[in-house]
Amino acid sequence: AVNGTSQFTCFYNSRANISCVWSQDGALQDTSCQVHAWPDRRRWNQTCELLPVSQASWACNLILGAPDSQKLTTVDIVTLRVLCREGVRWRVMAIQDFKPFENLRLMAPISLQVVHVETHRCNISWEISQASHYFERHLEFEARTLSPGHTWEEAPLLTLKQKQEWICLETLTPDTQYEFQVRVKPLQGEFTTWSPWSQPLAFRTKPAALGKDT
């Protein structure tokens, strides 16, 4: 939602967190700003303090409950407001009617581990974190592998078009250090976006056996 010269973007992690970023052209003076969440059909409301992340950008997380509690559903609409202190009052700087399941961004996958490694292959598994049971199997993943001498940006993306929490990396070079990352996205939601990348998992392929092709 854009009001005046500001941009206000929020995502729901599908369970109990709404993360928001508010950017404003022309930095505000030292003033206190908050995000207020008012669901249309629930008794609770929530507030978080916006903290600067850059010259003209602020962010905060609305913690709606215990991490794995299902605080919102597909029918909920949450009025989100950016409020900034002016004198003793609050001024509404931006406002949006937020449909949580149209604006999803899940938590980064966790618990990455090497299940099995060989000279040219590596099997890796992971888990999704704080993802709603509503998705059932309607998730997709992207993975990337960092090879020596390359950057993450250069790494080709591997797409898994189903809820598959493992991958078998092929055609690897023996005795070589690699790093691996994965991210997740629900299929639902017009404005849904990819989760952040997972923490990289470092692994090393096995050296080739002398005089033997593995």
Epitope: T5, G87, W90, R91, V92
Partner: antibody, heavy 121, light 112 residues
Amino acid sequence: EVQLVQSGAEVKKPGASVKVSCKASGYTFTDYVISWVRQATGQGLEWMGEIYPGDGNTYYNEMFKGRVTMTRDTSISTAYMELSSLRSEDTAVYYCARGSYTYDNYAMDFWGQGTTVTVSS
Amino acid sequence: DVVMTQTPLSLPVTLGQPASISCRSSQNIVHSNGNTYLEWYQQRPGQSPRLLIYKVSNRFSGVPDRFSGSGSGTDFTLKISRVEAEDVGVYYCFQGSHIPWTFGGGTKVEIK
């Protein structure tokens, strides 16, 4: 119905202080801001500042800083405005007015009847 | 501080005729949230001010539809389509976009 009832007229000597009260009824006192506005005789309106009774937080117009103090007593839904070091130019009608804690639409919707303060030696 | 300048100072009008009051701000009063907090207050003789118009053109509850507000940026107008006897008094514009909030000097509407 919303009502703001102010204290009676005051006559003060230069250098003295005056404390004007504003008793609110018909709404939840701690949910709204109380602004203070003055009107010197035959002059326009001047916004002096305001207090949020919910937490006692105040904001004063720089023009009055150091001389004005706004307080409240939530137990009797009353706001106070004290002006010190009075001079003849402070002779005016002082109004309290209610305002929304979140400034979505307007600054002040309901006003008190005004308190006349005369500063004269 | 934002200076609000009203014209005319005095406005003699005939009952049933239209009236127009101008208010000019010394700087743009569009708030950084995109809204313009320009308000009009009416003060009848011997009474407290009363809110008429907020955010340039919105009538406050109970305000007759003969009152209308318009304008943008730095130039604003209050119009009374057909003046009635009860409209006599002083009209003030007010900006709530930039602290400290400020009033115009007032325009006195009287019957000819």
